[in-house]
């Protein structure tokens, strides 16, 4: 806490400018009017204040706005944003995407800090849903943003926003998240033709059910192996050898190279060996010819 001391004669700040960098902390406190600071916040960024001096400026704003800063001030915080705590940010009401962008720019190149996470949370909650422009902005700064949301939070994403999602934005999503996003993507891209549809939906297929994979297998999509291995195991297991061959096209050859990994391994164990032999890969571990396959889960359901 800076002590209240009178401003020395002739030192009262008329505007926020470079001369203030020579002020001691107590002089800043005494000689800079908080209302002047608030109206000239855009100048602070251009002046090389020390961290200690920035602390004083923050303190002045806190005194002026105990209930939280107005958006006109927030938009011009610049590096002063890094001094804010999540508790400070929870008092704000940020509604402008431009304000959000300005603050994200300050933190660019760094991991998402608790301050940024709080800011985004406040912004999205204020908007009521994660619209396309917001999603565009957030994934541009933080490609992993979408996958940091819970399935419940993702459920508020409208299908129209899915157009903003790039494949790399989904890299760290788990199956539960893709389960929520896939139906939205399916809806968003439903009017596209076969090959264009597959290009767009491919990144979301980790949430696709078996029947959708069967439908895709009829469309000559040539799914690559990396995409195939991200599919839900429970969705892959019921697929026949013929369906997997059609789904992967030339990439089916790669099953041999990945036969020890899920879901390939589990799928192989479910297939008849003579069907596997038709793939021309020397895959082993299928159900021997002549054996009868009992679906025990069906039997349990009946008893």
């Amino acid at each position: 806490e800076v002590e209240k001391t009178a401003c020395p004669s002739g030192k009262k700040a008329r505007e926020i400018d470079e001369s203030l960098i020579f002020y001691k902390k107590w002089e800043l406190e005494a000689c800079v009017d908080a209302a002047l600071l608030a109206t000239q916040m855009d100048r602070v960024n251009a002046i090389p204040f020390t961290y200690e001096q920035l602390d004083v400026l923050k303190h002045k704003l806190d005194e002026l706005y105990p209930q939280g800063y107005p958006e006109s001030v927030i938009q011009h915080l610049g590096y002063l944003f890094l001094k804010m705590s999540p508790e400070d940010i929870r008092k704000w009401n940020v509604t402008s995407l431009e304000t959000l962008k300005a603050l994200l720019e300050v933190n660019k190149g760094h991991e998402m800090s608790p301050q940024v996470a709080t800011l985004i949370d406040r912004f999205v909650k204020g908007r009521g849903q994660l619209d396309k422009d917001t999603l565009d902005t957030l994934t541009a700064f933080y490609p992993g943003y979408l996958c940091s949301l819970s399935p419940e939070e993702l459920s508020s994403v409208p299908p129209s926003s899915i157009w903003a999602v790039r494949p790399q934005d989904l890299d760290t999503c788990d199956p539960r998240q893709l389960d929520v996003l896939y139906p939205k993507a399916r809806l968003a891209f439903q009017n596209m033709n076969g090959s264009e549809y597959f290009v767009k939906i491919q990144s979301f297929l980790g949430g696709a059910p078996t029947e959708d994979l069967k439908a895709l297998s009829q469309q000559n999509v040539s799914m690559d192996l990396a995409t195939f291995m991200k599919l839900r195991t429970d969705a892959v297991l019921p697929l026949t050898v013929a369906e997997v061959q059609k789904l992967l096209g030339p990439h089916v050859e790669g099953l041999k190279a990945e036969e020890r990994h899920r879901p390939v391994r589990d799928w192989i164990l479910r297939q008849r060996q003579d069907d596997l032999d038709t793939l021309g890969l020397g895959l082993q571990g299928g159900i021997p010819n002549g054996y009868l396959v009992l679906d025990l889960s069906m039997q349990e359901a009946l008893s």
């Epitope: 291995m229 089916v252 793939l279």
Partner: antibody, heavy 117, light 113 residues
Framework: EVQLVQSGAEVKKPGASVKVSCKAS????????MHWVRQAPGQGLEWMGN????????YYNERFMSRVTMTVDKSTSTAYMELSSLRSEDTAVYYC??????????WGQGTLVTVSS | DIVMTQSPDSLAVSLGERATINCKSS????????????LAWYQQKPGQSPKLLIY???TRESGVPDRFSGSGSGTDFTLTISSLQAEDVAVYYC?????????FGGGTKVEIK
């Protein structure tokens, strides 16, 4: 020992077709896919397509889609690649290569196809 | 199509010295589930067919001398010959087998300085 022995050099006129053979030995022919790759004189390598020798299903690089046909004869463990409507830029060494999973683990000695009027 | 860019085009290295060849792909070659990178390296000596050296970016094919090593992940890969021998004079190619059409780099010619 795995061996892929290709047919001899060919000289063809523009517009003609050529069929290159690749006889495999030393492994179970139907357990490994066969690829075809070509190399123009002094140039790099270009993948043309692959074939499943068990089912005969083949997949082609779109650049050659309308002109290439890949087939196999399981009884003789031989793969074939036929390229039609030949033009001078098809002059190249054509290789068959046996897959090792996805990568090309064994290569034939190559067949030089010269297209000249 | 995935574009493979090799550098340098040619390389002159003294016997016993290290040779390093780079290969960059226009998109990731990493299968994030298996953590395998779908990249292979081949050696083609003058007048011969190509020969597989490395697959999955870093797995040495059996019979390949251990002076050859591959590294890298995602989009950036390297083939290193730790101590160049006279018999290593050749053109080296990288190839992606992530998505068809499988594509090769333009090749790097390695010579003795």
């Amino acid at each position: 020992e795995v061996q892929l022995v290709q047919s001899g050099a060919e000289v063809k006129k523009p517009g003609a077709s050529v069929k290159v053979s690749c006889k495999a030995s030393g492994y179970t022919f139907t357990n490994y896919w066969m690829h075809w790759v070509r190399q123009a004189p002094g140039q790099g390598l270009e993948w043309m397509g692959n074939i499943n020798p068990s089912s005969g299903d083949s997949y082609y690089n779109e650049r050659f889609m309308s002109r290439v046909t890949m087939t196999v004869d399981k009884s003789t463990s031989t793969a074939y690649m036929e390229l039609s409507s030949l033009r001078s830029e098809d002059t190249a060494v054509y290789y068959c290569a046996r897959s090792g999973g996805l990568w090309l683990a064994f290569w034939g000695q190559g067949t030089l196809v010269t297209v000249s009027s | 199509d995935i574009v493979m860019t090799q550098s340098p085009d040619s390389l002159a290295v003294s016997l016993g010295e290290r040779a390093t060849i780079n290969c960059k792909s226009s998109q990731t070659l990493l299968n994030s589930v298996s953590q395998n990178n779908y990249l292979a390296w081949y050696q083609q000596k003058p007048g011969q067919s190509p020969k597989l050296l490395i697959y999955f970016a870093s797995t040495r094919e059996s019979g390949v001398p251990d002076r050859f090593s591959g590294s890298g992940s995602g989009t950036d890969f390297t083939l290193t010959i730790s101590s160049l021998q006279a018999e290593d004079v050749a053109v080296y190619y990288c190839q992606q087998h992530y998505r068809t059409p499988y594509t090769f780099g333009g090749g790097t010619k390695v010579e003795i300085k």
